[in-house]
Amino acid sequence: ITGISPITEYLASLSTYNDQSITFALEDESYEIYVEDLKKDEKKDKVLLSYYESQHPSNESGDGVDGKMLMVTLSPTKDFWLHANNKEHSVELHKCEKPLPDQAFFVLHNMHSNCVSFECKTDPGVFIGVKDNHLALIKVDSSENLCTENILFKLSET
């Protein structure tokens, strides 16, 4: 990561391409992540998105990218961040201190209309996606699949 401080941060609600909300619930002293339809007028959970610039030549990164990328961390509540668990193909909320581990960083993609996708920094080609009403890690095999609805999300500040 180029800078240890984010270039910007803001609060937004996260929803799927099909307008289901991503919600976070405290259960047995740990947080669970759900994908669900909210009732009318039900308040959406907010996530703090922190954006970082990543700068590297392609020969260092191994991901074929030369230049700048936008990395993001997602925190729905103080001291908890979304983490990629690549072994379990799962997305989890972990309590941790800064500096955050690489598993908490996701490369932001927003080349598909007004949706965004989150690619694991630790596992290029693997994205946060929706599976069985939960968030999971989904391997995207080809460029065409980058437009697959289950890895597309919407950000809203309202």
Epitope: T8, G67, M69, L70, L108, N110, H112, S143, L146, C147
Partner: antibody
Framework: QVQLVQSGAEVKKPGASVKVSCKAS????????MHWVRQAPGQGLEWMGE????????SYAQKFQGRVTMTRDTSTSTVYMELSSLRSEDTAVYYC???????????????WGRGTLVTVSS | DIQMTQSPSSVSASVGDRVTITCRAS??????LAWYQQKPGKAPKLLIY???SLQSGVPSRFSGSGSGTDFTLTISSLQPEDFATYYC?????????FGGGTKVEIK
């Protein structure tokens, strides 16, 4: 170094079509979207649309929907912008532009072609 | 579509002056605003991105501020090469939209 080389100036009659090319070099072509922005003489900048070279998906400004087609050829790292049913108001310099960040347009457009002047006149 | 309103449309200033240009979005665009400089017959040049981040190679006399709907570009001490037209652009959602431009002229 990173550069975008555009095709030369065109003079077209009303009702005709024009196809402008933009050849990219010096970077990983499929990692960056390509945007098209036009500027009529003495006027401001107007965004026309974007193509994602990775899969070829496009997003067009409503104003140009149905008249514009953006395509890409990954084998030559070239994108194309075709505008049909030309009218005199389409006389402008057409720029291709690459975003500052891979996969995202949030950080602005930092690499621009020199522009292609398209003149529509009977 | 998000409308971007830039003001003033032109400003006359002298070398050494401090120049401020404002840009207002018709709805919130988070911090995703870029500023460009354009000289006659040339392509635009990115100066500022994400509202306040200085693009590599751009002199530090240029600065950006603001978030949400109201943004400002400041040139702290105008230099002869800064006489040009400046555009803001929202990079939050498609369609991307530009302000109408501000021409900085020699007084």
């Amino acid at each position: 170094q990173v550069q975008l080389v555009q095709s030369g100036a065109e003079v077209k009659k009303p009702g005709a079509s024009v196809k402008v090319s933009c050849k990219a070099s010096g970077y990983t072509f499929i990692s960056y979207g390509m945007h098209w922005v036009r500027q009529a003489p003495g006027q401001g900048l107007e965004w026309m649309g974007e193509i994602n070279p990775h899969g070829g998906s496009t997003s067009y400004a409503q104003k140009f929907q149905g008249r514009v087609t953006m395509t890409r050829d990954t084998s030559t790292s070239t994108v194309y912008m075709e505008l049909s049913s030309l009218r005199s108001e389409d006389t402008a310099v057409y720029y291709c532009a690459r975003p500052s960040a891979a996969y995202s347009h949030y950080l602005g457009l930092d690499i621009w072609g020199r522009g292609t002047l398209v003149t529509v006149s009977s | 579509d998000i409308q971007m309103t830039q003001s003033p449309s032109s400003v006359s200033a002298s070398v050494g002056d401090r120049v401020t240009i404002t840009c207002r979005a018709s709805q919130g665009i988070s911090p995703w605003l870029a500023w460009y400089q354009q000289k006659p017959g040339k392509a635009p040049k990115l100066l500022i991105y994400a509202g306040s981040s200085l693009q590599s190679g751009v002199p530090s006399r240029f600065s950006g501020s603001g978030s949400g709907t109201d943004f400002t570009l400041t040139i702290s001490s105008l230099q002869p090469e800064d006489f040009a037209t400046y555009y803001c652009q929202q990079a939050n959602v498609f369609p991307l939209t530009f302000g109408g431009g501000t021409k900085v002229e020699i007084k």
